[in-house]
């Protein structure tokens, strides 16, 4: 039975040209995390594997940095970065937990962070 929940940074906004940290935290389970994937729609951005460490997809290497922690830092944001981002926790024995973050990249300087929320 999957008892865990993923807490994410929720709906967030940031300014064009700036940077943002995407964060997910898996809690309420003692399952062993074996890998965490970060994806944007259907594109793989990065992987953190228990044995191999971090791997950033070559097409994102210039604009994506691992961390802090299991989070992901997106840099030099463009309006095309607006959209859904997913953190996918692969665990044993529970299986897969997925968290969703919606990022809106704004032209103006009125970007504000949204509140955190939980996804079971």
């Amino acid at each position: 039975m999957m008892t865990g929940t993923i807490e994410t940074t929720g709906n967030i906004s940031a300014e064009k040209g700036g940077s943002i940290i995407l964060q997910c935290h898996l809690s309420s389970t003692t399952a062993q995390v074996t890998q965490v994937n970060w994806e944007q729609q259907d594109q793989l951005l990065a992987i953190c594997n228990a044995d191999l460490g971090w791997h950033i997809s070559p097409s994102f290497k210039d604009r994506v940095a691992p961390g802090p922690g299991l989070g992901l830092t997106l840099q030099s944001l463009t309006v095309n970065d607006t959209g859904e981002y997913f953190c996918i926790y692969h665990t044993y024995p529970d299986g897969t937990y997925t968290g969703r973050i919606f990022l809106e990249v704004l032209e103006s300087s009125v970007a504000e962070h949204g509140a955190r929320f939980q996804i079971p």
């Epitope: 935290h25 995390v33 594997n49 044995d51 460490g53 971090w54 950033i56 940095a65 691992p66 802090p68």
Partner: antibody, heavy 120, light 107 residues
Framework: QVQLQQSGAELVRPGTSVKISCKPS????????LGWVKQRPGHGLEWIGD????????NYNEKFKGRATLTADTSSSTAYMQLSSLTSEDSAVYFC?????????????WGQGTSVTASS | DIQMTQSPASLSASVGETVTITCRSS??????LAWYQQKQGKSPQLLVY???ILAEGVPSRFSGSGSGTQYSLKINSLQPEDFGSYYC?????????FGGGTNLEIK
């Protein structure tokens, strides 16, 4: 087995800087975050920052930003912490520590510590 | 920054006794809590992470529990090698911060 070997004790003048080294062995240096922690008697433990040698990515505690510089030389599998503009408050033992994979900031292996004394 | 408050600051106990050390965080850290043991003049050693997972090689007499903002470390049947200082630390995000420590001494 995993070991982290730190450089020896340092006696430095206030206002100068110090550079401490940490050479891990027993694991793939580029695959794990390596953090630095300050310990001063009566002041407990303080996290300074960490570095991911597999790309040189760094995170810093705001308190140490601008004064601490973390670097890693992958050719010699050695990490360094430089602390500048030293004062007596910087007299402490500094530890390097490896973060557990996929349990970021839970530090599972520690160096033996390097004592730094800032005194004129 | 998240503040970690540890209690008691010091504790005297005898070999064979059971002791509990508690740690409170200033906000919910979702079980991202680690416990370390440190002997005089040595480096800290990881005992527990994610509030309740024992690190490799840690004896089963140690156990961690808690959630939200309240956590504890329990040591059953104290052994002579268990005396020293204990620290809690959240590993929920940056910067990770530590509790002030608990000094466990022999009665």
């Amino acid at each position: 087995q995993v070991q982290l070997q730190q450089s020896g004790a340092e006696l430095v003048r206030p206002g100068t800087s110090v550079k401490i080294s940490c050479k891990p062995s027993g694991y793939i240096f580029t695959n794990y975050w390596l953090g630095w922690v300050k310990q001063r008697p009566g002041h407990g433990l303080e996290w300074i920052g960490d570095i991911y040698p597999g790309g040189g990515y760094t995170n810093y505690n705001e308190k140490f930003k601008g004064r601490a510089t973390l670097t890693a030389d992958t050719s010699s599998s050695t990490a360094y912490m430089q602390l500048s503009s030293l004062t007596s408050e910087d007299s402490a033992v500094y530890f390097c520590a490896r973060s557990r994979q996929l349990a970021s900031y839970a530090m599972d292996y520690w160096g033996q510590g390097t004592s730094v004394t800032a005194s004129s | 920054d998240i503040q970690m408050t540890q209690s008691p600051a010091s504790l005297s106990a005898s070999v064979g006794e059971t002791v509990t050390i508690t740690c409170r965080s200033s906000e919910n850290i979702y079980s991202y809590l680690a416990w370390y043991q440190q002997k005089q003049g040595k480096s800290p050693q990881l005992l527990v992470y994610n509030a309740k997972i024992l690190a490799e090689g840690v004896p089963s007499r140690f156990s961690g529990s808690g959630s939200g903002t309240q956590y504890s470390l329990k040591i059953n049947s104290l052994q002579p090698e268990d005396f020293g200082s204990y620290y809690c630390q959240h590993h929920y995000g940056t910067p990770p911060t530590f509790g002030g420590g608990t000094n466990l001494e022999i009665k």
